[in-house]
């Protein structure tokens, strides 16, 4: 699937809904086009099937072009863990859009990651806390479900619960972003 991102304007962000994290600004601080792959260098690809998009984790043939995703970065407040209502610094959140008007979303009930067509303001499920990891990798934590990350399960993207004190280095939640 091609990534047509011209006229792709992310001009308004999230309207906070009493969630545990709030987006500071209504527009992204920056945007970037990048291909997404797993720690083991499998590509994340998107295909239109029966009028909906499917997400695949697969080995790409050498000559096949990688699908690009538009990452929109937002500055966000991190809540104080003690009081719950105070602010404990800043963090970066992202939305991921592989094609115009479609965004990756967390489906916490099904523990799945899905592509949905949406309008602004985007729902909370479309926002992920971006974590900077070793080995030039990142992780994506659900805004709506702290401790739950996008991961790879059975060659698909899924939501995976992570125990901070043990598995933050789990390879199945590590992803590579490449701008080339």
């Amino acid at each position: 699937m091609g990534s047509s991102h011209h006229h792709h304007h992310h001009s308004s962000g999230l309207v906070p809904r009493g969630s545990h994290m709030s987006i500071t600004g209504i527009s992204p601080i920056t945007e970037s086009l990048a291909s997404l792959s797993t720690y083991n260098d499998q590509s994340i690809t998107f295909a239109l099937e029966d009028e909906s998009y499917e997400i695949y984790v697969e080995d790409l043939k050498k000559d096949k072009k990688k699908d690009k995703v538009l990452l929109s970065y937002y500055e966000s407040q991190h809540p104080s863990s003690e009081s719950g209502d105070g602010v404990d610094g800043k963090m970066l959140m992202v939305t991921l859009s592989p094609t115009k008007d479609f965004w990756l979303q967390a489906n916490n009930k099904e523990h799945s990651v899905e592509l949905h067509k949406c309008e602004k303001p985007l729902p909370d499920q479309a926002f992920f806390v971006l974590h900077n990891r070793s080995f030039n990798c990142v992780s994506f934590e659900c805004k709506t479900d702290p401790g739950v990350f996008i991961g790879v399960k059975d060659n698909h993207l899924a939501l995976i619960k992570v125990d901070y004190s043990e598995n933050l280095g789990s390879e199945n939640i590590l992803f590579k972003l490449s701008e080339t």
């Epitope: 003690e82 610094g89 963090m91 970066l92 990891r133 070793s134 901070y164």
Partner: antibody, heavy 119, light 111 residues
């Protein structure tokens, strides 16, 4: 309130050892990457070492590799820096720092503890 | 390693004046589309304080008179109107890659 309090600094002879501690409070310690940054008297800042949340990864500046070890005890909300084979050039104020949530920048700093290596 | 060079070494200004501090990196500090360049303020006898992260975003509780700009290798910290408490040393720092490095600092002193 988020707080980092360093201790363990002092005067030590060249070749000696010292262990610095950093007691953290006011946040979920295990969720954050932690680092040590030092500042020699009258000089600039130098990153020393980092340990990720979950104790998975550690990184060091070349000048301390093999001599310093960063570690953490999440049950005690404490960060450590074990310093062996100390040299005069290790003399500095050592700051404990916490990354922001997501590990993109040093966000919270302790007051520092002074380590003096001298005979 | 990425070397950060700050200029000027010292800036002598009066309260109310505009301060412009520069930081140049030996190579791009961009990663994932983000400029991973941060600014810190340090006063004598105190630890550094985060002012700006990712080139242009203010840290928690940082007044609006502080702003950051730039991308790639060239970055600027601007203090729009100096307050008495702003006279301090300012450091830039890159978090693109290990070893994380700091500039040598710019001292903003009262003229």
């Amino acid at each position: 309130e988020v707080q980092l309090v360093e201790s363990g600094g002092g005067l030590v002879q060249p070749g000696g050892s010292l262990r610095l501690s950093c007691a953290a409070s006011g946040f979920t310690f295990s969720s954050f990457s932690m680092s040590w940054v030092r500042q020699a008297p009258g000089k600039g800042l130098e990153w020393v070492a980092t340990i990720s949340g979950g104790k998975t990864f550690t990184d060091y500046v070349d000048s301390v590799k093999g001599r310093f070890t960063i570690s953490r005890d999440d049950s005690k909300n404490t960060l450590y820096l074990q310093m062996n084979s100390l040299r005069a050039e290790d003399t500095a104020v050592y700051y404990c720092t916490r990354a922001n949530y997501g590990n993109w920048f040093f966000e919270v700093w302790g007051q520092g503890t002074l380590v003096t290596v001298s005979s | 390693e990425i070397v950060l060079t700050q200029s000027p070494a010292t800036l002598s200004l009066s309260p109310g004046e505009r301060a412009t501090l520069s930081c140049r990196a030996s190579e791009s500090v961009a990663k994932y589309g983000l400029s991973l360049l941060n600014w810190f303020q340090q006063k004598p006898g105190q630890p550094p304080r985060l002012l700006i992260f990712a080139a242009s975003n203010r840290g928690s509780g940082i007044p609006a008179r502080f702003s950051g700009s730039g991308s790639g290798t060239d970055f600027t910290l601007t203090i729009s109107s100096l307050e008495p408490e702003d006279f301090a040393v300012y450091y830039c720092q890159q978090s693109k890659e290990v070893p994380f490095t700091f500039g040598q600092g710019t001292k903003v002193e009262i003229k």
